[in-house]
Interface confidence: low
Amino acid sequence: MAFSGSQAPYLSPAVPFSGTIQGGLQDGLQITVNGTVLSSSGTRFAVNFQTGFSGNDIAFHFNPRFEDGGYVVCNTRQNGSWGPEERKTHMPFQKGMPFDLCFLVQSSDFKVMVNGILFVQYFHRVPFHRVDTISVNGSVQLSYISFQNPRTVPVQPAFSTVPFSQPVCFPPRPRGRRQKPPGVWPANPAPITQTVIHTVQSAPGQMFSTPAIPPMMYPHPAYPMPFITTILGGLYPSKSILLSGTVLPSAQRFHINLCSGNHIAFHLNPRFDENAVVRNTQIDNSWGSEERSLPRKMPFVRGQSFSVWILCEAHCLKVAVDGQHLFEYYHRLRNLPTINRLEVGGDIQLTHVQT
């Protein structure tokens, strides 16, 4: 199922973060929090679904704690008072590692998936429609927070004007040989014009259903591979594409292609057998010259989750991995609107695609 007309994502927001959930929580809304647990001495982080910004009314407090072997606390706070904790004595997060955390709002509960696996259900203690804010705090760095509204609505025109809630900017291209350490992208008023999010459905009308077996055995609802889909409206300056997934433990290679007809305008090809991230363009079945330079070590790791963020600008594509700028790729095919197909294949499992 695809989701269009959804709230634009918050991109690389600073932590602590509080942001509005446009229209509040609704049955079927899926919210994805993608980031990395910091390696620092902090032992906790939290994602809160709350009313307003005060923190006194939190419908769902999701609180991983790297303490006592690791566990996750779920709770509700009403008028400043916490209710009884629900503890999950399993820690699906690792310090220093990226994660993909999905919350599905359903009529009776929140379902929480971590890296594609159903982790916990939290039954509503207060009406979820009161929630209008998401907040994140603690020992975590965020890549993005995205929203997937399941209502099938007419797709927006390719140049509608939904702005980024927190827009994106890549660091300027370095002039010297040495590149500065990459950071989180600061703000830039580039508008996002359309969001289409692809997810895997387990049953009609819902993202994943209550499993018939204990939650920890619930398998990854994986995107079939290769995954190929249309980029509505093609590329244009400010167009953003987000992907997240997990590299298979025995991975050799995978690819993300942006295609125009029979041409591959942009081929992003992490190669674990060569410890390289190869970029290239294929026109009429002929490959051009490869680009391999990186400002830091190979960001993709076998067996680990990742997020890739591709931002189209007038002269180049800018690519970030796990919220950190990685490289620029100057357009070789310049008819951007014709670059309208995304192909992902190889040794990964996709958990989230947003075009």
Partner: antibody, heavy 127, light 109 residues
Framework: EVQLVESGGGLVQPGGSLRLSCAAS????????IHWVRQAPGKGLEWVAY????????SYADSVKGRFTISADTSKNTAYLQMNSLRAEDTAVYYC????????????????????WGQGTLVTVSS | DIQMTQSPSSLSASVGDRVTITCRAS??????VAWYQQKPGKAPKLLIY???SLYSGVPSRFSGSRSGTDFTLTISSLQPEDFATYYC???????????FGQGTKVEIK
């Protein structure tokens, strides 16, 4: 038009070998998942093997593991099934099929199944 | 390996009948289940993919549904051309082989 055409079947003695071919047209084998499925006379469908040439990944049913080898020649847009140490119970019609994951209309739907099949080729193992 | 237990193995029905065929997976396979129709001497044809999505060109009288690990193929009003054998198949093959159900032969009553 997508088409799959198998060839290479025939009569072979137990312990012998055969190589089946699956010539594809209308799509590229290199970025597709190609499967072999067999059907013994009067029996149901049994999955045999698949290959995803892009990442050189493949998998086999336990019943053929170590005896059958799946491969692909992307320049010929053809997949192969090399069958060694054949047994009487390998007698079947062998189909190749494309496991498709293409979206339709750009709105995130995909085919999660084998959408195109060949006509089948009969392999008979008998002395 | 994931087993797909299909039932019934055969059934007799008349034109216009509503027919239901069930497959139960031995463990969760998400919605990675497809249904095929096969006629004698022919290759199978895809009917339903992802448990409930109707494949292109397949008549709307065919439908699929999922409840936990149970998957159902329904023919709302059986037509003469629907007499065939039907197979379910789980496609969760990253870590498990693909497996088919044993098949259900739909015969004329």
């Amino acid at each position: 038009e997508v088409q799959l055409v198998e060839s290479g079947g025939g009569l072979v003695q137990p312990g012998g070998s055969l190589r089946l071919s699956c010539a594809a047209s209308g799509f590229t084998v290199s970025s597709s998942s190609i499967h072999w499925v067999r059907q013994a006379p009067g029996k149901g469908l049994e999955w045999v093997a698949y290959i995803y040439p892009y990442s050189s990944s493949s998998s086999y049913a336990d019943s053929v593991k170590g005896r059958f080898t799946i491969s692909a020649d992307t320049s010929k847009n053809t997949a192969y099934l090399q069958m060694n140490s054949l047994r009487a119970e390998d007698t079947a019609v062998y189909y190749c099929a494309r496991y498709s994951t293409y979206s339709w209309g750009g709105i995130g739907k995909w085919v999660w199944g084998m959408d195109y099949w060949g006509q089948g080729t009969l392999v008979t193992v008998s002395s | 390996d994931i087993q797909m237990t299909q039932s019934p193995s055969s059934l007799s029905a008349s034109v216009g009948d509503r027919v239901t065929i069930t497959c139960r997976a031995s463990q969760s396979v998400s919605s990675a289940v497809a249904w095929y129709q096969q006629k004698p001497g022919k290759a199978p044809k895809l009917l339903i993919y992802s448990a409930s999505s109707l494949y292109s060109g397949v008549p709307s009288r065919f439908s699929g549904s999922r409840s936990g690990t149970d998957f159902t193929l329904t023919i709302s009003s059986l037509q003469p051309e629907d007499f065939a054998t039907y197979y379910c198949q789980q496609s969760y093959y990253d870590s498990n082989p693909i497996t088919f159900g044993q098949g259900t032969k739909v015969e004329i009553k």
